[in-house]
Interface confidence: low
């Protein structure tokens, strides 16, 4: 397995609707046709898989139907969106990229994006 550099933003603030987007960019050493992108969440020294998708170069990412992630790809960049986030989901979200085909296999892991999620304050009752 060969190493590959992956870059992602250090910090992202989720929207009030619990949506966070960030770009994951990888330095592709060759012309991969199949790329695997995995989002990992690290919190309290625990690492869990948030979502994963495979795409063919020049095509859209396909996540499982019940995934909280969506994404698009453009060249060596993947635009990832994670939805349904709550304050408790605040943590370090790591982008892992694998060049699956053709050989050789390359693996790259980013330093992580700290996503901050602030639950919106409930709207006060209004009298009209």
């Amino acid at each position: 397995c060969k190493a590959m550099h992956v870059a992602q933003p250090a910090v992202v603030l989720a929207s009030s609707r619990g949506i966070a987007s960030f770009v994951c960019e990888y330095a592709s050493p060759g012309k991969a046709t199949e790329v695997r992108v995995t989002v990992l969440r690290q919190a309290d020294s625990q690492v869990t898989e948030v979502c994963a998708a495979t795409y063919m170069m020049g095509n859209e990412l396909t996540f499982l139907d019940d995934s909280i992630c969506t994404g698009t790809s453009s060249g060596n960049q993947v635009n990832l969106t994670i939805q349904g986030l709550r304050a408790m989901d605040t943590g370090l979200y790591i982008c892992k990229v694998e060049l699956m085909y053709p050989p050789p296999y390359y693996l790259g892991i980013g330093n992580g994006t700290q996503i901050y999620v602030i639950d919106p304050e409930p709207c006060p009752d209004s009298d009209f």
Partner: antibody, heavy 117, light 107 residues
């Protein structure tokens, strides 16, 4: 709603040919793997072949390599399995399934292929 | 190629029992292991993906876990509709392989 409907099964003699079809609807056909998986009577599941319609990428199990050909028509949202030089051991229910990278998340109802003289 | 050895091949259990099915990979694999349920005459249905993620619409009594090369499907409290055959499956490069299956029967 995601749907996969297989057709084309039937009785064929050893050495004969058959073409199975898998009509897909309810999702972007070209951006998912489409698999064929078979199940011999009373036996377990055996993965047969896969295609990624967007690029035409294909791969086969060793047991069918050189005899079976998987293809897809994105204009018809349909995948095919052309089976040549059929043997008695190819007798099975053939399922088509939609796949993400590691899993097969939607399956058709299956079509029975019987190879017998 | 990686082989998935599933055990037991069959088991008898009662409604309410806790049931555990194991798949052992012949060599180190990723967590790209899924579990399916199949009833007679029907197509398989996805239960668990990525070793431990519960698929949409699947009851929470089903769970998956991993320990090294061992992958486990657990049904915490067996229900009448759970009597079926269960298969594990993994992808190794461009081969998708299934375990031999475990038939869960009524005791």
């Amino acid at each position: 709603e995601v749907q996969l409907v297989e057709s084309g099964g039937g009785l064929v003699q050893p050495g004969g040919s058959l073409r199975l079809s898998c009509a897909a609807s309810g999702f972007t056909f070209s951006t998912y793997y489409i698999h064929w998986v078979r199940q011999a009577p009373g036996k377990g599941l055996e993965w047969v072949a896969v295609i990624y319609p967007y690029t035409g990428f294909t791969y086969y199990a060793d047991s069918v390599k050189g005899r079976f050909t998987i293809s897809a028509d994105t204009s018809k949202n349909t995948a095919y399995l052309q089976m040549n030089s059929l043997r008695a051991e190819d007798t099975a229910v053939y399922y088509c399934a939609r796949g993400e990278y590691t899993v097969l998340d939607y399956w058709g109802q299956g079509t029975l292929v019987t190879v017998s003289s | 190629d990686i082989q998935m050895t599933q055990s037991p091949s069959s088991l008898s259990a009662s409604v309410g029992d806790r049931v555990t099915i194991t798949c052992r990979a012949s060599q180190s694999v990723s967590s790209a292991v899924a579990w399916y349920q199949q009833k007679p005459g029907k197509a398989p249905k996805l239960l668990i993906y990525s070793a431990s993620s519960l698929y949409s619409g699947v009851p929470s009594r089903f769970s998956g876990s991993r320990s090294g090369t061992d992958f486990t499907l657990t049904i915490s409290s067996l229900q009448p509709e759970d009597f079926a055959t269960y298969y594990c499956q993994q992808r190794d490069s461009y081969l998708w392989t299934f375990g031999q299956g475990t038939k869960v029967e009524i005791k």
